[in-house]
């Protein structure tokens, strides 16, 4: 058993039929010694008396908010949550496996630049009685500070018969050095509680590996005289790290016909312009990637050829 926060305790249980469970001793936070009784959740049934209560925790029915009282007055609360371990593996029932980039990916994170700011998100099909608390650091043995806000419900989607909820959180490294080579990874830890079930999820990454630039901005076409060719120009996204001479991007320019089956013409360039042939009903799209490190491409910015 360990303390998650003041008055909230996590009981770690091996989860199998007829498991013995864990013996837990609760102590009433009061100078009082006599006349103390204990109840669980909303029940008025007295579970025991005295300053301490000893319970055998085996299942969710044994978890919950234990309250000690004296003469009708509440003295203190202790909330017991359960963390299940089945066949040596901690349960992951609350969050959905996103399966990308690999199986057992519950947290996904992205950064728009090298400023030390990043966003993580996760999915669940659970709609209420949920708690998410996020902590982060750079490195784990001598951790350096990363500040995370409160998670927010960022999207709701219908997937077949199920509703899926996306939660996200923004974090910022306290003393980020954008140009420095990273030697220690960022660690992100999410404590998740559904009703009385506790689970924790972690992700470890270098900012360089989660970079995904915003799409190029101000995408424009300039027809070239007496030609089917056009000059496509664009700019670095506002959110990208500066100076651009150091934090450079490379770009992919694509000409795509109306039909997905039509051949795509692609040009790669380090410049912020390119000359391409604009076919009727086609569209021109440009995306960006860090020039010197193969992290994710941005989403496409697009304009019609006409």
């Amino acid at each position: 058993i360990w303390e998650l926060k003041k008055d909230v305790y996590v009981v770690e249980l091996d989860w199998y039929p007829d498991a013995p469970g864990e013996m837990v001793v609760l102590t009433c936070d009061t100078p009082e010694e006599d006349g103390i009784t204990w109840t669980l959740d909303q029940s008025s049934e007295v579970l025991g008396s005295g300053k301490t209560l000893t319970i055998q925790v085996k299942e969710f029915g044994d978890a919950g908010q234990y309250t000690c009282h004296k003469g009708g007055e509440v003295l203190s609360h202790s909330l017991l949550l359960l963390h299940k371990k089945e066949d040596g593996i901690w349960s992951t029932d609350i969050l959905k496996d996103q399966k990308e980039p690999k199986n057992k990916t519950f947290l996904r994170c992205e950064a728009k630049n090298y400023s030390g700011r990043f966003t993580c998100w996760w999915l669940t099909t659970i709609s209420t009685d949920l708690t998410f608390s996020v902590k982060s650091s750079r490195g784990s043995s001598d951790p350096q500070g990363v500040t995370c806000g409160a998670a927010t419900l960022s999207a709701e989607r219908v997937r077949g018969d199920n509703k899926e909820y996306e939660y996200s959180v923004e974090c910022q490294e306290d003393s980020a050095c954008p140009a420095a080579e990273e030697s220690l990874p960022i660690e992100v830890m999410v404590d998740a509680v559904h009703k009385l079930k506790y689970e924790n999820y972690t992700s470890s990454f270098f900012i360089r590996d989660i970079i995904k630039p915003d799409p190029p901005k101000n995408l424009q076409l300039k027809p070239l005289k007496n030609s089917r060719q056009v000059e496509v120009s664009w700019e670095y996204p506002d959110t990208w790290s500066t100076p651009h001479s150091y934090f450079s991007l490379t770009f992919c320019v694509q000409v795509q016909g109306k039909s997905k089956r039509e051949k795509k013409d692609r040009v790669f360039t380090d410049k912020t312009s390119a000359t391409v042939i604009c076919r009727k009903n086609a569209s021109i799209s440009v995306r960006a990637q860090d020039r010197y490190y193969s992290s994710s491409w941005s989403e496409w910015a697009s304009v019609p050829c006409s």
Epitope: L79, T128, V134, A150, V193
Partner: nanobody
């Protein structure tokens, strides 16, 4: 001393409206996600609504959506719950609660601070 003090409860007829307030003292509200949780007579606690630190995101339990509106005034260190189209089943003690993280839990201990509650009775 840290305190959350609810007010604005009372007796109202079905279909009527009430506005609950929750004044915080001893801490600044804008560091916290704020919630309303209620307890009907003889029932367990039920999460009602939550609002993000900056007020930009609001969340409601299904049966409260469209009838209740949560808001906050960080400058006044106060949380509000505007309740309209009230029904007898909305009769409960309404508590406000503060947490530094996202929660829609009904367990008091998961919140950092918790008020004493204000009684709302919907009856003709």
């Amino acid at each position: 001393e840290v305190q959350l003090v609810e007010s604005g409860g009372g007796l109202v007829q079905p279909g009527g409206s009430l506005r609950l307030s929750c004044a915080a003292s001893g801490f600044t509200l804008d560091d916290y996600t704020m919630s309303w949780v209620r307890q009907a007579p003889g029932k367990g606690l039920e999460w009602v609504s939550s609002i993000s630190r900056d007020g930009g995101r609001t969340y409601y339990a299904g049966s409260m959506k469209g009838r209740f509106t949560i808001s906050r005034d960080n400058a006044k260190n106060t949380l509000y719950l505007q309740m309209s189209s009230l029904k007898p089943e909305d009769t409960a003690v309404y508590y406000c609660a503060a947490a530094t993280f996202y929660t829609t839990s009904t367990y008091i201990s998961l919140y950092d601070y918790w008020g004493q509650g204000t009684q709302v009775t919907v009856s003709s």
